[in-house]
């Protein structure tokens, strides 16, 4: 069962001092939503017992395995059902505490009732404040039964539930008709899924015989021990004030476990701690009684004395629950209550016994759950004991369960049952995950979901080049850390597999499925440098670079040019996909911008060192286009262009540029500067006769502006072939006839 305890502090003079604490003894309990499981939850369950809303309760976590609920402001806040949930996965367990108001009309004689399937359960509600009305019984909040108020027997109302079945489990309440629900007596009925002394799916297995009030769990056959007792069969008492499956927890406060109610996983329910009884667990056991709720009677023999926490304390020469066994009777010594082995191992189990006459090898035997008896292969005889060693055949899952070591001599016999847990070594269900890769190393996350049993003690990563027959390389790592595989070959596929191990001999599981992980290319090592750059327009930049000369092939796939615009905080990246390229034209840049420029060689996804940066200022954008451009042929070799100045100029024009191109021609256009910016007319000379030309123009201030519209005009015919167009400018007001 899960080691989970819900403690209720019942010192009820002041509700504000009331608290509930949930303590988990599970490994890694409550650490949050990490690989080891969800946190402890502690809450009031208002589904069945609804109380008036109040301020929210305060939840405080104390370390990883304890959570406390406080903030109760009035007694009615306490009444009802509280639950703590702990454990991970299939072991997730809910522990329930039912709190009754001490001032209620009806009080339960006993809150928790654990019964076996088919038993008759009797719930008894004691009259605390009489009302002369019917008593209504409810089950899980729904009407169940009515009793007339005259039906009280010795001041108690009894509800008999014959032949109970597991679905009968739940919260029962007894309330006087029309009384407040807070004045009800609340009970918890737990019905085990099997008849007395049985457990398992078909109730075919026999319980180990839980001692000291322990209750056999109907699913796994384990004893859920009362607070203050431990061992497979709850045979061992904890020291006073301690609880938990291994007596590892200590009751808070100076008065130990006084005033505390302990709730444990079903089918145990709740009780006072060992040595205490009463509705508020504040009364010490009467003489001759001990244990949780003082339910056990000592009946010590042979001079034994009764300790209210642990039972009979035997004088020298006697042992046993009632000091009924003489030390002459053989006795099994120091047998572990629980042992764990891995599947298919062949462990050695030791069993030591003492007695008079002295036990010999043949007098000690080991019995498996299926009834098979093993005889010891070796015995070590010492002055005070004989230790028999048993070689166990290869373990199978069916070997899980209660084993028994038995010693028999002419002085009598003794036996000790112990639990053997056969665990399945873990096998990864998935391949490891690649986190990052470089040319010579892979970083891998090895911990994956697995079948079989934890905890994971070691993780082995096996790897070798793909399609290789060479031996696997192995690295052993911590389960919670990522692994770096080093000294690998670049641009190589590796087959990688995980192997998990759990503690103990034979804990290594089978290898998990393989996955292919490929190392990156070698990093490019050459550092380019920028040879030069020139502006080819307000938004265009031509860049050139060089590489150092080195012997051997160039390690690289291309170049990455980076332009950083510091003003806007923007980076522009340009990929040049040829490693032979040494120049690139960058277009679409922002005019008037300061750029920092560098270049670096790349190979696969890896970048080499960047060149020393250069700083480039692009000229600002130019002026708007000239308006109303018009062309007029003057002769067979001259055409006059007229225009109007651009509007909304950002500054004085430095020149105009005219573009001349033969219509339909394939050659490059000719650009002609008009260096007198005040001109609004120019004559283009040296044109070919009877030829159709296209003209457009733009202005320049610090940078070239936008092109005007394109105009078309033909020279007049019958002229000679000209040498090429030239221009002559005049101010428009001079006229064409001068």
């Amino acid at each position: 069962a899960v080691d989970l305890t819900l403690l209720a502090n019942l010192r009820l003079t002041d509700p504000q001092r009331f608290f509930l604490t949930c303590v988990s003894g599970e490994a890694g309990a409550g650490r949050g939503s990490d690989a080891w499981g969800p946190p402890l939850l502690l809450e009031k369950d208002d589904r069945i017992v609804r109380t008036p809303p109040g301020p929210p309760l305060r939840l405080a976590r104390n370390g990883s395995h304890q959570v406390t609920l406080r903030g109760f402001s009035k007694p009615s806040d306490l009444v009802g059902v509280f639950s703590c949930v702990g454990g991970a996965g299939a072991r997730r367990t809910r522990v329930i505490y039912v709190h009754n108001s001490p001032g209620a009309h009806l009080l339960p004689d006993k809150v928790t009732h654990t019964v076996n399937k088919g038993d008759t359960a009797v719930l008894s509600a004691r009259v605390h404040k009489e009302k002369q009305t019917d008593v209504i019984w409810k089950s899980n909040g729904s009407y169940f039964y009515t009793l007339d108020w005259h039906e009280a027997q010795d001041g108690r109302f009894l509800l008999q539930l014959p032949n109970v079945q597991p679905p009968s489990s739940g919260i029962y309440s007894a309330t006087y008709l029309e009384a407040s629900p807070l004045g009800s007596a609340f009970f918890r009925l737990i019905v085990r899924g099997c008849g007395a002394g049985r457990w398992g799916p078909g109730c075919t297995k026999e319980c180990p015989g839980c001692l000291h009030g322990g209750v056999c769990h109907d699913h796994d056959g384990e004893c859920v021990c009362p607070p203050g007792f431990t061992g497979t069969r709850c045979e061992q008492a904890c020291r006073e004030g301690r609880f938990g499956q291994s007596c590892q927890e200590q009751c808070p406060g100076i008065s130990g476990c006084r005033g505390l109610t302990f709730c444990l996983p079903d089918p145990y329910g709740c009780s006072c701690g060992s040595g205490w009884r009463g509705s508020q667990c504040q009364e010490a056991c009467a003489p001759g009684h001990f244990g949780a709720d003082c339910r056990l009677q000592c009946q010590c023999q042979n001079g034994g004395t009764c300790d209210r926490f642990s039972g009979c304390v035997c004088p020298s020469g006697w042992h046993g629950v009632h000091c009924e066994k003489s030390d002459r009777i053989p006795q099994i010594l120091n047998m572990a209550s629980e042992l764990e082995f891995n599947l298919e191992t062949m462990p050695r189990i030791n069993c030591a016994a003492a007695g008079n006459p002295f036990p010999v090898r043949g007098s000690i035997e080991l019995r498996k759950p299926d009834g098979t008896v093993l005889l010891s292969t070796k015995a070590i005889v010492e002055p005070e004991k004989t230790t028999a060693e048993f070689e166990v055949p290869r373990l199978v899952l069916a070997d899980s369960g209660f084993w028994e070591c038995r010693v028999s001599t002419s002085g009598g016999q003794d036996s000790r049952r112990f639990k053997v847990n056969v665990k399945v070594p873990p096998v990864p269900l998935a391949a490891p995950r690649l986190l990052t890769k470089q040319s010579r190393q892979l970083v891998v996350s090895p911990l994956v979901s697995f079948s079989g049993d934890g905890p994971i003690s070691t993780v082995r990563l096996h790897y070798r080049p793909q399609d290789s027959t060479m031996d696997w390389s192995t690295i052993v790592v911590d389960p919670s850390e990522n692994v770096t595989l080093m000294n690998l070959r670049p641009k190589t596929g590796y087959s990688v597999r995980v192997q998990l191990s759990r503690p103990g001999e034979g804990g290594e599981g089978a290898w998990g499925p393989p996955t292919l992980m490929t190392t990156d290319c070698p990093e490019p090592l050459l550092q380019p440098w920028l040879e030069g750059w020139h502006v080819e327009g307000t938004d265009r930049l031509r860049v050139s670079w060089s590489l150092p000369l080195v012997p051997g092939p160039l390690v690289g796939d291309g170049f990455l040019l980076r332009l950083w615009d510091g003003t806007r905080g923007q980076e522009r990246r340009e990929n040049v996909s040829s490693p032979q390229a040494r120049t690139a034209l960058l277009t679409g840049l922002t005019p008037g911008t300061h750029y920092q420029l560098d270049v670096q060689l790349y190979h696969c996804t890896l970048l080499g060192p960047a060149s020393p940066p250069a700083h480039v200022l692009l000229p600002p954008s130019g002026p708007p286009a000239p308006r109303h451009l018009h062309a007029q042929a003057l002769s067979d070799s001259e055409i006059q262009l007229t225009w109007k100045h651009p509007e909304a100029l950002p500054g004085p024009i430095s020149k105009y540029v005219v573009e001349v191109q033969v219509a339909g021609g394939a050659g490059d256009p000719l650009w002609i500067d008009v260096d007198r910016p005040e001109e609004t007319s120019t004559i283009i000379r040296g044109l070919n006769a009877s030829t159709r030309y296209l003209f457009r123009m733009r202005a320049s201030i610090q940078g070239l502006g936008d092109w005007s519209n394109t105009v078309e005009e033909s020279t007049l015919g019958n002229g000679l072939q000209a040498e090429g167009p030239v221009q002559e400018s005049r101010a428009a007001e001079e006229g064409l006839d001068q």
Epitope: T133, D134, T146, D148, E151, E178
Partner: antibody, heavy 117, light 110 residues
Framework: EVQLLESGGGLVQPGGSLRLSCAAS????????MHWVRQAPGKGLEWVSV????????YYADSVKGRFTISRDNSKNTLYLQMNSLRAEDTAVYYC??????????WGQGTLVTVSS | QYELTQPASVSGSPGQSITISCTGT?????????VSWYQQHPGKAPKLIIY???NRPSGVSNRFSGSKSGNTASLTISGLQAEDEVDYYC??????????FGSGTKVTVL
């Protein structure tokens, strides 16, 4: 569906006897109080008797005390009313009703008892 | 026999609210919050419409509401409708573990 069905009514002479039955279905009969309530022609409702789930506790209206006996058979899910020494004023429609805490829900459709010579 | 006192008849126009009173003693109405109200159509069995003074069973119109002050309980029918023209009875648990009904009220919709 919770259902109650009365039977056994009829014409009976003064001083005579009659046994009414009420068959219950659709609920756990053995867990509830059961009542008989009657209504004389053109008159109001009159509570007659109650029996507790165990059958051990019964109460009667003063007008029928000593003459009527309420009983139940939880194994048969049936409620009974044994009426002896009947009088003309016992003429009424007799209803059985399930008692949930302090009220009646549901009711049967009723059976008519006529006491007349 | 005990009898709780109800008016023999109460009338109201459609859409109006009417209230039916039910007066008992401190051993019944005044002693417990266990007053219930029943509606009865002619020739039919009574039907529970209010329990524990003011609670409505599921399926009962919210035009019906109940209250109690001292030894007198009341049933209010708001937004009176033609189909409300039937008989209404109050009932109460008593200190002797018996039950008692009112004399009944005939509601008329004008």
């Amino acid at each position: 569906e919770v259902q109650l069905l009365e039977s056994g009514g009829g014409l009976v002479q003064p001083g005579g006897s009659l046994r009414l039955s009420c068959a219950a279905s659709g609920f756990t009969f053995s867990a509830y109080k059961m009542h008989w309530v009657r209504q004389a022609p053109g008159k109001g409702l009159e509570w007659v008797s109650v029996i507790y789930p165990s059958g051990g506790w019964t109460y009667y209206a003063d007008s029928v005390k000593g003459r009527f006996t309420i009983s139940r058979d939880n194994s048969k899910n049936t409620l009974y009313l044994q009426m002896n020494s009947l009088r003309a004023e016992d003429t009424a429609v007799y209803y059985c009703a399930r008692g949930t805490a302090g009220w009646f829900d549901p009711w049967g459709q009723g059976t008519l008892v006529t006491v007349s010579s | 026999q005990y009898e709780l006192t109800q008016p023999a008849s109460v009338s109201g126009s459609p859409g109006q609210s009417i209230t039916i009173s039910c007066t008992g003693t401190n051993t019944d109405v005044g002693g417990y919050n266990l007053v219930s109200w029943y509606q009865q159509h002619p020739g039919k069995a009574p039907k529970l419409i209010i329990y524990e003074v003011s609670n409505r069973p599921s399926g009962v119109s919210n035009r019906f509401s109940g209250s109690k002050s001292g030894n007198t309980a009341s049933l209010t029918i708001s937004g009176l409708q033609a189909e409300d023209e039937v008989d209404y009875y109050c009932g109460s648990y008593t200190s002797s573990s018996t039950h008692v009904f009112g004399s009944g009220t005939k509601v008329t919709v004008l």
